[in-house]
Interface confidence: low
């Protein structure tokens, strides 16, 4: 028996359902009574779901997994993982045994988009050219850790005097806070880009500092 999975990671958004695809080629006359199917975590060998002795043995993993029972006889051994969490990320191995056995691993990459950044300024009044200001860009509830980029109004990257911190909450999602310290020019626009490297998603925020009231 030959097991096939995608070698490209399955990307799943937090709180959505993901399908880890696994298939095999059944011989003519194959029946489910012959099938032993086991899904387990690749590294720890923890059992996730199994089908043995002609029946679905159910989820052994937080009751959030399911097979596709009507498709098993056609060789579809895929696993459905419901309400994906950050802690589900990792490699899963699909073992199929009929007479001989084969197995293959599929990786699950969990992702969550970052919110539109909010921009704050300190100090936020009586600003003059030459003043040192601190601009904070905050974006929330993303995964995995973000890449943060600052640019000025001409699109020139600002790399000096940037401090970025990322903190995970109880769900494993990251809040990112990036602080730019900059000396004000006569007028200036400062933009922050928060990129999710897995989703290739960019979230933008900017602040324009003029002689007039600030615009965000």
């Amino acid at each position: 028996v030959e097991v096939q999975v995608s070698e490209d990671p399955v990307v799943a958004l937090v709180d959505t359902d993901a399908t880890l695809r696994c298939s095999f080629s059944p011989e003519p006359g194959f029946s489910l009574a012959q099938l032993n199917l086991i899904w387990q975590l690749t590294d720890t060998k923890q059992l996730v779901h199994s089908f043995t002795e002609g029946r679905d043995q159910g989820s052994a993993y937080s009751n959030r997994t399911a097979l596709f029972p009507d498709l098993l006889v056609q060789g579809n051994a895929s696993l459905r993982l419901q309400r994906v969490r950050v802690t589900d990320e990792g490699s899963y191995t699909c073992f199929v045994s009929i007479q001989d056995f084969d197995s293959a691993a599929v990786s699950l990459q969990v992702a969550a988009p970052y919110s539109k950044p909010s921009m704050t300024l300190e100090p936020n009044k009586d600003l003059r050219p030459g003043n040192m200001v601190t601009i904070t860009c905050s974006s929330y509830q993303g995964y995995p850790e973000a890449e943060v980029f600052w640019k000025d109004g001409q699109g020139v990257p600002l790399t000096g005097n940037v401090t970025t911190s990322q903190m995970a909450n109880e769900r494993g999602l990251f809040d990112v806070h990036s602080v730019l310290r900059v000396v004000l020019g006569a007028n200036g626009t400062y933009s922050c880009l928060v990129r999710n490297p897995v989703l290739q998603q960019d979230a933008h925020g900017s602040v324009t500092i003029t002689g007039q009231p600030l615009t965000f």
């Epitope: 490209d8 690749t42 590294d43 293959a104 691993a105």
Partner: antibody, heavy 116, light 111 residues
């Protein structure tokens, strides 16, 4: 840390045989397909062969079909390439690589020289 | 003659953006995802881009990949001297039942 270490290369006469080995560590070897890729001196990459995780299916480039045999021993975390009827054009650095369709880790390679 | 066609060479100066193309057919690029590999002088190849446009962790975001129809391309922005290397595209060919590489592109960083 994933590591792939090839061995078994050397100088062999045309028509001779060699067996290359690739010792794998740092990942669950038995769950991944594996491949051999070669590079002749000063030339580009050429895929040689690939094998499924359980060893049930094997694929070969036309240039080596019938002469080379890929195999694996999952109990030893080792991939093999048996090369028979070697020709001068088989001279190359042979790399083993993790996966069959997307080579995410490579060994440092072992040099095979076929010359009389 | 490689199944996938790449320009043999490309060049740029530090800070520039360089694009490397990879042209195939419906049986390879047209039906399977493309992977890009970087081979620095005297070293083994390294995975650079997978699934047409995804970067493994550790690969700078200056590297990006894209695919349209039966062609793929690798773009390198903000070119650096350490990017001087050979770049290969690769994918599975369903007709040949084999993995195929492009002939490779030697990238030179000038100046």
């Amino acid at each position: 840390e994933v590591q792939l270490l090839e061995s078994g290369g050397g100088l062999v006469q045309p028509g001779g045989s060699l067996r290359l080995s690739c010792a794998a560590s740092g990942f669950t070897f038995s769950s991944y397909g594996m491949s051999w890729v070669r590079q002749a001196p000063g030339k580009g990459l050429e895929w040689v062969s690939g094998i499924y995780s359980g060893g049930s299916s094997k694929y070969y480039a036309d240039s080596v079909k019938g002469r080379f045999t890929i195999s694996r021993d999952n109990s030893k975390n080792t991939l093999y390439l048996q090369m028979n009827s070697l020709r001068a054009e088989d001279t190359a650095v042979y790399y083993c690589a993790k996966n069959r369709l997307r080579f995410d880790y490579w060994g440092q390679g072992t040099l095979v020289t076929v010359s009389s | 003659q490689s199944v996938l066609t790449q320009p043999p060479s490309a060049s740029g100066t530090p800070g520039q953006r360089v694009t490397i193309s990879c042209t195939g057919s419906s049986s390879n690029i047209g039906s399977n995802s493309v992977t890009w590999y970087q081979q620095l002088p005297g070293t083994a190849p390294k995975l650079l881009i997978y699934s047409d446009s995804h970067r493994p962790s550790g690969v700078p975001d200056r590297f990006s990949g894209s695919k349209s129809g039966t062609s793929a391309s690798l773009a390198i922005s903000g070119l650096r001297s350490e990017d001087e290397a050979d770049y290969y595209c690769g994918t599975w060919d369903a007709s040949l039942n084999a993995y195929v590489f492009g002939g490779g592109t030697k990238l030179t960083v000038l100046g």
